[in-house]
Structures are given as structure tokens and as C-alpha cells.
């Protein structure tokens, strides 16, 4: 036995992480995120469950809807119609995949304090929303969109084509509610909730992905999803715009795919209303280097929807697929008809462009060796961005404002020196016209959110500060976090190295990669997180590192289209670099070296342990690819291009993980996946397993019954737990 | 249902202070604003001013230096006192409800209590 | 303080016409107008606040619009039971300041 070293009376109060910690949310923050409802009023649910509406100006607030009320119907979600005179109550949540969910809903009457009665809603509602005025609802009940002039009237049935796995209208199909939109609604309301446009996918001819769903049944349910893998066939989309005034006059108008996109095989990437006379549509082709962007503009005299070549503006790519990880949306200004946009420069990295005409004629609002990220909001004389640029670390985010009423343009930072040790990464909420706006700072210390003045960036008060986990974390061991960069071969790799405690650099420690590394990701950021690897490093004295190699996104695209048709390859290869660049300074056990990663980072890890470099022991793969012919045809497309002879089959071959399953022979090897799993296929795990199995190759496995790509509740801590366990037994440490 | 009574004097002398109650049933005024707004025989309505929630007031400039707004959460009641009345002080004086849900605009009035000021 | 004016104060119509009454504001009040009905010897009654919307239980005939310092009053189809002195109200910013009325007489 060792007795423990004791440094001063104050440590030895200090206790390590423990994985409990961990598997409890103890030591979770709390983010503060106003619901705004004008330019100076938001609401927010108290901790007593009240739904209470806070006026900055007066400061005073008002609760609108009372916890009584929202427990009557077991509500855990509300919306407040504009007009202010009903709300919307959500229960009986249903999960279905990462955004998408069905509930029961009901219509609370704020005026006479009671529920609408009459007319009620059917359930359950697939997606239900407020017009952006007064209180006109639109839902989409069995995949057929209704519309309600008011909460108490009868519903006026818009589509009735809707059918299960076949047509869905005003909601995404799996893959363009995975891939495309990330949203669980495909329906849009203009500006004033004069029109609603909306998607309509047609699934009908996309292969079906099935698996068993265990359930408690004497026999298992079949899960029946129409899920495009890459070279299949594609869902088929198109849009509509109907009058909500007279939704019965002319009915719903298809808008125009523009020729040079409907040439061939294509997807609708997003919609975005500019008056209520004109909408932008944005098209890309099935291989995803060419979008098109389309301003459409109603047609009184014949109720339709003209969308003129003149108002078409082409965004392509020459060096990889368009955009980052999706294609960037317009921000208009007021005059209805120019935007600003983030796209690639002339040397590559994202920017905000200002396009009043052509795209060739864009001014260039933003520039430098670092990349603007989100437009949160243009007013009349301000443009308010978060980048990467301050002190060129990539892995932060500060928020920057324009002023775009002067000439030349002025910025000014308006985080980078508020909080600037604690705060280094931050997103923002705006009021309507920005006449305030919540900052939220995520780290790289505790996370806090505060309220703004729009015209002076004055901070008003603090919204969230999290004093008790500050608390909480007083006499807790946090490992050491630093994050640096290696320059090799004239390619900068970032890093996140995550250190025990009491770290000596005259020591041998074990090191694990955390390893994501999928295209236009980023895992090196300046965020606040007590995780599993934060315990792995207090308690269990490893060194945690993750790297952010060529593929990951926010430092230009050199490095972001490095990877493009050649997923599997250079991602790989910078995590081996990394690992020997960490050897090389000197207090790393090179015996002892693990590789572990979920999803993308699956893929990674298990590539990377069948590398043959002998840097590795042992290694996870959670949920991991195994071959890009199984994954989505959209993500996968937008890197791989399509697998087949005349383009990119042979890299699709070269690049699975089966076809290293030799080199498994000498690592230790977990694989673990749900076999409920939507997103990335139980099938992906299986035939891993398959090739192993048929090399002789001896790995270990743990499968979760009826669960999905996310692993959770109770599996959750079985998985982090079996995971712990597996890598102490690695490295040789005492459990 | 919501209900405001305003109780007040009747007959006020000049130079003398005007009280008057509101008494509020149907709400909670922790969670509304109250508004006092007067109208003279035959002319316009004029805003007074109000009591927020929170029971911070704020007032008509041309009445800041002799009107007074407070209330008591408990009695569901709002107190107007107005110092130093003279005759063109004579008007109907209304309590209102005002909140967020209608933009703090004015959704229910009081039925208006007289006020004559007269020697 | 934001005035508002109603530049009629009185309005001559019959039961069934459309009437629209208009009020201006001094400055910039974005949507924060109301209106207010007063029928003879009662207390005002809102219709319509934050420029647009109808109050609870308001006829459908009474419509709102306008934005920045235009606001418009409209009765679709006049009844006999519109008789009465309708004032806009600006509730954008204290003071909150009322138009001078604008009366509706029935020919």
C-alpha cells in the first residue's frame, strides 16, 4: 500500500472524480436560453414550473400560465400564440428519431382561463406550430397537413396524399430529417402567416431498412424504415406554397425547381421567407457540389409562384462538396432582396459575403485566416457573427458585430474580453430587432448566461451563473486541460490534452484518444465538460487527448476538403501523427496507449487499431461505420461520391473496416452497438463482427437490446461502465 | 370573472386630496399592472399612471408631483391619492387592468368612480 | 410625450356602410396601438390592441392595421350598436397617451 502523497491540508479535502459522478449528472450546468416574444419580453419556465414573462424594460414579470394548469395536462412543453391569447400545452412525448416526435396536444384559452373545447385536436400530432401572427395553427396529424383559422374552429385539411413510409408532408423523411434539414418539421410560415409553404417527400421507391425490435413481446417487433443508403434510390421532394386566407380558392402551388437542378438527380436543402411575397428556396444536386439558390416571388394575376433565372445564384465547389457540413442559408437585409451568406473565399476559408445581384459580384464582409461561423442577426445598421477569429485559437467562438450603416463597415468584438479567462466559447439569442440579446458562454470554465442591451452590448443582469455546481466542484480534483497545436508537415494539428491531477511531467502516464473526426466536425473546443474522460484522468490518472486532424472543420478548407472522396484515409493517419508527437514528449507509457470513439469516431478508432502501427493496446468502437455502402446516402454522398465503377466504388471497397479485420489480431478490441440502432446500422457491428470472426480474430462485444445510435437512459451507464472496466483491465490498473 | 370597483369621495374641496380605492376580484395582482385614467365631463381620457406588478409606479409627468400609486397584494386593492385638486380636476376616474397579454394595452376597466371637485 | 390625433372627431355613417377611422401618432409607436370603443355613459371596452389583433370576443367586423405612426380603424358592416366614441391609444411608451375620440353618429 502507498500511502497518498498529502500537498497541503486543502487538497487532502479534495476528492477525485468517480465515475458515479459522472453517471448522476452531478456535476451537469444549466444554460439559460430566453424565449423570446418581442423586442424586449421573454418567457421562461421558473423552477416551480410557472410559466412566467419578463419585461427587461419594466422589469417586471407576469406569470401567464400557472403550473396548475400545465400539470392538468402533464404538459412539459408550451407555445404562446402571437397574438398572446392561447397557448399551446405538449404531452405524452414520443420520441421517434433524432429530432422527430409525436405528442398530444392542447389549446389553453388565456382570456377565460379555460381549455378550447370543440374542434379538438386528433392525436397523436406529428408537428403542430402557432402562424408567426394572431393564432392560426398548422399541423401535420398521419402525414397530411391541416390548418385552423382559429384554435376552436374546424381544421381545414390542406394535403391528403400522407402515408406512412411512403409520402410525408410538412415533416422529413428519416434522411432529410437526419441529413438535410436537422429539423422535425418541413412547413414554413411567411413573415405575417398570409402563406404556408411546406415539403412533400415521396418514399415510395427507397430501399426499407428493417430490424427486429425486441420489445416484451413473444415476438419482436419489425422496425420498417425507407432509408436511402449510398448509390440507392432517393427520396423525391417537392414544394408547395398555399394561401392560409383562402386555403380552399386555389389550393397549394408547386414552387419550380430550377432547370439546371432538376437535370438530374436532386434534394431541396432549405427554405427562407423574405416578405410574405417572396421566398428563397435553396436546391442542391445528388452530388453535392453545386447549389443553387432561388428567389421566387408570387404572382398575383395568376396565384403562382415565379421563380426567374435572374434570381438564381449558383454556389459550387472545386476543391470539395458545397458548404461545410451543410449548406449555409441566407440572412436577408431589409431591403427584401440582397443577403449575406457564409461561403468559401478565394483562399478558402468560410466568410460572410453580402450579395446584392450575383454571386460573382459578392462583397466580401469578413476576412482572414479563420472562419466566420453563424450570422445570428441583421438589423438596419448592424450585423451581429460568431467566428473563430480572436487569438486564432479555432476552438473558440466569440460574437462580433458590424456595423453596416457606415462606411467601411466597423467590428467590434463584443465577448472576446468580457469573461476572457472563464468565457472563450459562446452562441447568442436575440430579440426581435436585436434590441437585446442573451449571451451564453459554454466555457472553457463554468458556463454562464447573461442578458445584453442591443444597442450598448451593456451586460443587464445574469441570467444562469451556475453557483451550485461552482459549489459543488470546490473540493473535487479536476484534471488539468490544455489545448495546443502540432505542426506537421505543414498541417496544424489542434489538440485537447486532458491531465490527471497531480500531473508530472517527469512521469509515464497511459494515454486514450477520444476520437470523433468526421467531416466539418470539431472536438478541440474551449468548452466546460465533467465527463467520463474527465473521471478517467481525476480517478484513474490517464491522459486524455483528442485531436482534430484533417476533415474537421473551422480552419479553412485545405484541411476541411482533405478528406474529400477519400473518407477513412487522412483522419487516421493525424491520429497515429498525434500519438507519436504525444510519445515524444516524454510522459506517455507507450505500452499503454487506447483509441476509443462513437459513431464517426468509431470508424476512426477502429481503423486506426487496424492501422499495423503497433501504437495501440486496445481500442472502442461504439456504433462505429464499417463500410460507407451502409450509411446514408446523403451524408456519405457529400464526401464519397457514389459508389459506383465510373466514380468512387474503389475507395468504398478500400475503406471498410472488414477489410482490415487481419490487423485486429494483435490489439485488444471492444465493439459495441444498439441493435435499435436508426442511424448507423446494427448491420455496420454485425458484419465487423462477421470478419473477425471468420479471420480467427478474438474481440470482445456488447450489444444493447432495443437501443438506438444514442445509447441511452440504463444503458448508459452499463456501456461507460463496461467501457471502464475494459480499458483498467488495458492499462493494467487496479479496479 | 374579473372585476374592478373603484370606492371614492364623490365631492372633493379645492387644494384638498383626493383617495380613491380599487378593489380587483378575478386576478391576482401580483401578476397584472393597474392603470388610473381619468375623464372629464364631456372630453378625452388621460392617463394617470400605473403600478406594476412588482409595485414600482410610474406617472404622468403633469401629475408626478401630487399623485401617488400604491396597493396591497393581500386585499387585492390599488390606492390613488392626489394632492392639491382644483376644479379641472373634476372627471370620472378609472381603474384599469393592464398586461402583457394584450401588449399592456387596457383589457378591463372599472365602471369609474365621479370625482367633483367643487368649494 | 407621443401624441396621438384622430383627425375626425366626428364620423356620419349609416347601418351596413364600411367606415375606417384613422389615427396618427407623433413618433414611431411600431405596432403598440390600441382602440377603444366608449358607448354612452359606460366605460371604455378594448377591441383592438397591438395595432391588429381583435380582443376576446370582439366581433369579427372591428379590424385593425397600420404600423409605425398610420394606424387604421375599420367596421366592416356597420350596426345600429356601433354608436358610440372610438379612441386610439398608443401603448408603446409611457405616458400612455389616448387620440382626442372620434365619434360615430348613425344617419
Known amino acids: 500500500l502507498r500511502p497518498s502523497r498529502v500537498h497541503n491540508s486543502e487538497e487532502n479535502t479534495m476528492r477525485a472524480l468517480t465515475l458515479k459522478d459522472i453517471l448522476n449528472g452531478t456535476f451537469s450546468y444549466k444554460t439559460f436560453f430566453p424565449n423570446w416574444i418581442s423586442g424586449q419580453e421573454y418567457l421562461h419556465q421558473s423552477a416551480d414550473n410557472n410559466i412566467v414573462l419578463y419585461n427587461i424594460e419594466t422589469g417586471q414579470s407576469y406569470t401567464i400560465l400557472s403550473n396548475r394548469t400545465m400539470k392538468s395536462v402533464n404538459a412539459s412543453n408550451y407555445g404562446l400564440s402571437p397574438d398572446r391569447q392561447f397557448v399551446y400545452l405538449e404531452s405524452d412525448y414520443s420520441k421517434l428519431w433524432r429530432y422527430s416526435y409525436t405528442a398530444t396536444y392542447y389549446i389553453y384559452d388565456l382570456s377565460n382561463g379555460e381549455f378550447v373545447r370543440g374542434n379538438e385536436l386528433p392525436r397523436p400530432i406529428q408537428y403542430l406550430c402557432w402562424s408567426p401572427v394572431g393564432s392560426k395553427l398548422a399541423y401535420v396529424y398521419q402525414n397530411n397537413i391541416y390548418l385552423k383559422q382559429r384554435p376552436g374552429d374546424p381544421p381545414f385539411q390542406i394535403t391528403f396524399n400522407g402515408r406512412e413510409n411512403k409520402i410525408f408532408n410538412g415533416i422529413p423523411d428519416w434522411v432529410y430529417e437526419e441529413e438535410m434539414l436537422a429539423t422535425k418539421y418541413a412547413l414554413w410560415w411567411s413573415p405575417n402567416g398570409k402563406f404556408l409553404a411546406y415539403a412533400e417527400f415521396n418514399d415510395t421507391d427507397i430501399p426499407v431498412i428493417a430490424y427486429s425490435y425486441y420489445g416484451d413481446e413473444q415476438y419482436p417487433r419489425t422496425i420498417n424504415i425507407p432509408y436511402p443508403k449510398a448509390g440507392a434510390k432517393n427520396p423525391v421532394v417537392r414544394i408547395f406554397i398555399i394561401d392560409t386566407t383562402y386555403p380552399a380558392y386555389v389550393g397549394p402551388q408547386e414552387v419550380p425547381v430550377p432547370a439546371m437542378i432538376a437535370s438530374s438527380d436532386y434534394y431541396f436543402s432549405w427554405l427562407t421567407w423574405v416578405t410574405d411575397e417572396r421566398v428563397c428556396l435553396q436546391w442542391l444536386k445528388r452530388v453535392q457540389n453545386v447549389s443553387v439558390l432561388s428567389i421566387c416571388d408570387f404572382r398575383e394575376d395568376w396565384q403562382t409562384w415565379d421563380c426567374p433565372k435572374t434570381q438564381e445564384h449558383i454556389e459550387e465547389s472545386r476543391t470539395g462538396w458545397a458548404g461545410g457540413f451543410f449548406v449555409s442559408t441566407p440572412v436577408f437585409s431589409y431591403d427584401a432582396i440582397s443577403y449575406y451568406k457564409i461561403f468559401s473565399d478565394k483562399d478558402g476559408y468560410k466568410h460572410i459575403h453580402y450579395i446584392k445581384d450575383t454571386v460573382e459580384n459578392a462583397i466580401q464582409i469578413t476576412s482572414g485566416k479563420w472562419e466566420a461561423i453563424n450570422i445570428f442577426r441583421v438589423t438596419q445598421d448592424s450585423l451581429f457573427y460568431s467566428s473563430n477569429e480572436f487569438e486564432e485559437y479555432p476552438g473558440r467562438r466569440n460574437i462580433y458585430r458590424i456595423s453596416i450603416g457606415s462606411y467601411p463597415p466597423s467590428k467590434k468584438c463584443v465577448t472576446c474580453h468580457l469573461r476572457k479567462e472563464r468565457c472563450q466559447y459562446y452562441t447568442a439569442s436575440f430579440s426581435d430587432y436585436a434590441k437585446y440579446y442573451a449571451l451564453v458562454c459554454y466555457g472553457p470554465g463554468i458556463p454562464i448566461s447573461t442578458l445584453h442591451d442591443g444597442r450598448t452590448d451593456q451586460e443587464i443582469k445574469i441570467l444562469e451563473e451556475n453557483k451550485e455546481l461552482e459549489n459543488a466542484l470546490k473540493n473535487i480534483q479536476l484534471p488539468k486541460e490544455e489545448i495546443k497545436k502540432l505542426e506537421v508537415d505543414e498541417i496544424t494539428l489542434w489538440y485537447k490534452m486532458i491531465l490527471p491531477p497531480q500531473f508530472d511531467r517527469s512521469k509515464k502516464y497511459p494515454l486514450l484518444i477520444q476520437v470523433y473526426g468526421g467531416p466539418c466536425s470539431q472536438s478541440v473546443r474551449s468548452v466546460f465538460a465533467v465527463n467520463w474522460i474527465s473521471y478517467l484522468a481525476s480517478k484513474e490518472g490517464m491522459v486524455i487527448a483528442l485531436v482534430d486532424g484533417r476533415g474537421t472543420a473551422f480552419q479553412g478548407d485545405k484541411l476541411l476538403y482533405a478528406v474529400y472522396r477519400k473518407l477513412g484515409v487522412y483522419e487516421v493517419e493525424d491520429q497515429i501523427t498525434a500519438v507519436r508527437k504525444f510519445i515524444e514528449m516524454g510522459f506517455i507509457d507507450e505500452k499503454r496507449i487506447a483509441i476509443w470513439g462513437w459513431s464517426y469516431g468509431g470508424y476512426v478508432s477502429s481503423l486506426a487499431l487496424a492501422s499495423g502501427t503497433g501504437l495501440f493496446k486496445c481500442g472502442i468502437a461504439v456504433a462505429p461505420v464499417s463500410s460507407w455502402e451502409y450509411y446514408a446516402s446523403v451524408y456519405t454522398e457529400r464526401f464519397m461520391g457514389l459508389p459506383t465503377k465510373d466514380d468512387n466504388l474503389e475507395h468504398y471497397k478500400n475503406s471498410t473496416v472488414m477489410a482490415r479485420a487481419e490487423y485486429f489480431r494483435n490489439v485488444d478490441y471492444l465493439l459495441i452497438h444498439g441493435t435499435a440502432d436508426d442511424n448507423v446500422h446494427f448491420q455496420n457491428s454485425a458484419q465487423i463482427a462477421k470478419a473477425l470472426v471468420n479471420a480467427q480474430v478474438d474481440f470482445q462485444a456488447m450489444w444493447y437490446s432495443d437501443q438506438n445510435h444514442g445509447l441511452s437512459g440504463l444503458s448508459t451507464n452499463h456501456l461507460y461502465t463496461h467501457m471502464t472496466h475494459f480499458l483498467k483491465q488495458c492499462f493494467s490498473l487496479s479496479d | 370573472q374579473v372585476q374592478l370597483k373603484e370606492s371614492g369621495p364623490g365631492l372633493v374641496a379645492p387644494s384638498q386630496s383626493l383617495s380613491i380605492t380599487c378593489t380587483v376580484s378575478?386576478?391576482?395582482?401580483?401578476?397584472?399592472?393597474i392603470n388610473w385614467i381619468r375623464q372629464p365631463p364631456g372630453k378625452g381620457l388621460e392617463w394617470l399612471g400605473l403600478?406594476?406588478?412588482?409595485?414600482?409606479?410610474n406617472y404622468n409627468s403633469a401629475f408626478m408631483s401630487r399623485l401617488s400609486i400604491s396597493k396591497d397584494n393581500s386585499k387585492s386593492q390599488v390606492f390613488l391619492k392626489m394632492n392639491s385638486l382644483q376644479t379641472d380636476d373634476t372627471a370620472i376616474y378609472y381603474c384599469?387592468?393592464?398586461?402583457?397579454?394584450?401588449?399592456?394595452?387596457?383589457?378591463?376597466w372599472g365602471q369609474g368612480t365621479s370625482v367633483t371637485v367643487s368649494s | 410625450d407621443i401624441v396621438m390625433t384622430q383627425s375626425h372627431k366626428f364620423m356620419s355613417t349609416s347601418v351596413g356602410d364600411r367606415v375606417s377611422i384613422t389615427c396618427k401618432a407623433s413618433?414611431?409607436?411600431?405596432?403598440?396601438v390600441a382602440w377603444y370603443q366608449q358607448k354612452p355613459g359606460q366605460s371604455p371596452k378594448l377591441l383592438i390592441y397591438?395595432?391588429?389583433y381583435r380582443y376576446t370576443g370582439v366581433p369579427d367586423r372591428f379590424t385593425g392595421s397600420g404600423s409605425g405612426t398610420d394606424f387604421t380603424f375599420t367596421i366592416s358592416s356597420v350596426q345600429a350598436e356601433d354608436l358610440a366614441v372610438y379612441y386610439c391609444q398608443q401603448h408603446y411608451s409611457n405616458p400612455r397617451t389616448f387620440g382626442g375620440g372620434t365619434k360615430l353618429e348613425i344617419k
Open positions: 397591438s395595432a391588429s
Open positions: 403600478i406594476w406588478t412588482g409595485g414600482g409606479t
Open positions: 413618433q414611431d409607436v411600431s405596432t403598440a
Open positions: 378575478g386576478f391576482s395582482l401580483t401578476n397584472y399592472d
Open positions: 384599469v387592468r393592464g398586461g402583457p397579454l394584450v401588449w399592456y394595452a387596457l383589457d378591463y
